[in-house]
């Protein structure tokens, strides 16, 4: 996950977010199937 | 030679759906965010939205969900699928790297016409 | 979303001439300098000069620089050359994404 060359805060900010998006996805997903396997 | 080839563009009827390629050489798109601007003949830009290297998405506020960004990775292309078409969306979809845009593809025409 | 404003819409110059085009942003961009300039000629897809308000892109020459902060950015050529002679966009990049959005342009044509 290199995401390109540019290192401005622009940049950073969307790596950033995109990296929360992705992490509250995957937790997300874990809960909803220890929820679904209970 | 690093380049962004877009693809699957064409004439389509209001209502219909069609889903277009971008297709990267020279470089692996798996280490790149990209994105999708698109222009109306005699227009100008416009903002679709991107893909970031983790697969999620941010939309321009005028998308509505009609439009869905994803990749594969494994075939180093990206995609921009687009449902619910009007006559409006009739433009020159172009895919371009990094949230900057800094490389573009040559484009692809969609008409939206009955 | 954000509404970018670029003027003038058209600008007719001559070659060695100064130019500047303006951007003006509806609310300001992500850490008040997260706006870009393209150029683009007819037929042809856009291509980046400026990013982060005023870092010029990796082979674009010198006599294009960017400034400006927050909600008012500028495009200037110091020397108009013949291959200058194209239509100008801003992009704007906000805290949300949503509001991304470009200018209207600006067609630089000769006088």
């Known amino acids: 996950h290199s995401d390109g060359i540019f290192t401005d805060s622009y940049s950073r900010y969307r790596k950033q977010m995109a990296v929360k998006k992705y992490l509250a996805a995957v937790l997300g997903k874990r809960y909803k199937q220890r929820v679904k396997n209970k | 030679e690093v380049q962004l080839v877009e693809s699957g563009g064409g004439l389509v009827q209001p209502g219909g759906s069609l889903r277009l390629s971008c297709a990267a050489s020279?470089?692996?798109?798996?280490?790149?965010?990209m994105g999708w601007v698109r222009q109306a003949p005699g227009k100008g830009l416009e903002w679709i939205g991107d893909?970031?290297?983790?697969?999620?998405?941010d939309y321009a506020s005028w998308v509505y969900g009609r439009f869905t960004i994803s990749r594969d990775n494994s075939k180093n292309t990206v995609y921009l699928q687009m449902n619910s078409l009007r006559a409006e969306d009739t433009a020159v979809y172009f895919c371009?790297?990094?949230?900057?845009?800094?490389?573009w593809g040559q484009g692809t025409l969609v008409t939206v016409s009955s | 979303a954000a509404q970018l404003t670029q003027s003038p819409s058209t600008l007719s110059a001559s070659v060695g001439d100064r130019v500047t085009i303006t951007c003006q942003s509806s609310?300001?961009?992500?850490?008040?300098?997260?706006l870009a300039w393209y150029q683009q000629k007819p037929g042809k897809a856009p291509k980046l000069l400026i990013y982060?308000?005023?870092t010029l892109a990796s082979g674009v020459p010198s006599r294009f620089s960017g400034s400006g902060s927050g909600t008012e950015f500028t495009l200037t050529i110091s020397s108009l050359q013949p291959d200058d002679f194209a239509t100008y966009y801003c992009?704007?990049?906000?805290?949300?994404?949503?509001?991304?959005?470009f200018g209207g342009g600006t067609k630089v044509e000769i006088k």
């Open positions: 020279g470089f692996s798109l798996s280490s790149y965010a």
């Open positions: 371009a790297r990094d949230y900057w845009l800094s490389l």
């Open positions: 982060a308000a005023s």
């Open positions: 609310q300001s961009v992500y850490d008040n300098n997260a």
């Open positions: 992009l704007g990049g906000y805290y949300d994404p949503a509001d991304n959005a």
């Open positions: 893909i970031s290297t983790y697969g999620t998405t």
